[in-house]
Amino acid sequence: ERLCHPCPWEWTFFQGNCYFMSNSQRNWHDSITACKEVGAQLVVIKSAEEQNFLQLQSSRSNRFTWMGLSDLNQEGTWQWVDGSPLLPSFKQYWNRGEPNNVGEEDCAEFSGNGWNDDKCNLAKFWICKKSAASCSRDEEQFLSPAPATPNPPPA
């Protein structure tokens, strides 16, 4: 019996997308690269439901985790890695007093019950996101794919 696996092994399915929560740590730019290497993107949050889901994943594991949000292009103007701006209705997710840009903090992370800005060169866990596969169109997607784990072997 063939089973539909909309996401690669070790990825989590939520509302039509697949998410990979890393088990190793990288800086923000290397986290972007790690996601690209597996055909994904450092997570861009598109809805309140998605935010709640991801925040829960991060807080449960008690990890500081990079998301695809920074103000590297222009200080104080937060932009997602897909080029879209941070909308005002999403600014509610910043932790109290954040973003504060203390010491050039230009990249956003999941921290506790909200978001925090931190230095982009710090190594943290990260979350990749890509669209889930549609099992009805392509038979190969009924097969369980080999693990796609964007974690480099230890140096």
Epitope: Q15, E49, P88
Partner: antibody, heavy 119, light 106 residues
Amino acid sequence: QVTLRESGPALVKPTQTLTLTCTFSGFSLSTGGMCVSWIRQPPGKALEWLALIDWDDDKYYSTSLKTRLTISKDTSKNQLVLTMTNMDPVDTATYYCARAHSGSYFDFWGQGTLVTVSS
Amino acid sequence: DIQMTQSPSTLSASVGDRVTITCRASQRISNWLAWYQQKPGKAPKLLIYKASSLESGVPSRFSGSGSGTEFTLTISSLQPDDFATYYCQQFNSYWTFGQGTKVEIK
């Protein structure tokens, strides 16, 4: 109480630039969560969102009109200005400014100002 | 951009009728939806925000429900003052209005 009032020319010629002002009271655009937006409505048609500015001075524009729009605020005067370049007869509409609660829904609206584009 | 589709475009009803207007989003918007009422020559008036929260001062005969992509505005017992055009609006990704539903006298 919260009030908003739009002002600007009633008639604009094609290719000209439209400048509209929204004067508001009862809240401050420097307060966290406060946003003001411009929305228009051609005669007999639906509402169309144009632009929004928030308490951080971040600006957001309609994808289809962003090359023609500029939104700015003067917090000390409690005023908002929208400029729209290269006006065309299809831009004839009632233009509203409205407060957006935390950048979400529009809880207070001005009465609107009708702008006609004609030569 | 997210598209909002309202149905029906026009609705004929009588005083006392239960009226339901539907709004569909082209992608999931959680509960980030508002409903407005507009009368001719007037600015829109907020009725419902976050899909189901009643704005202060709005009569309790108005209610909203839904989440994700499907939403409804219900008027439990239509009153003479309710004949107007109703718009839904999403605020999950930028801001988009539906095309409107005109509620007219049957």
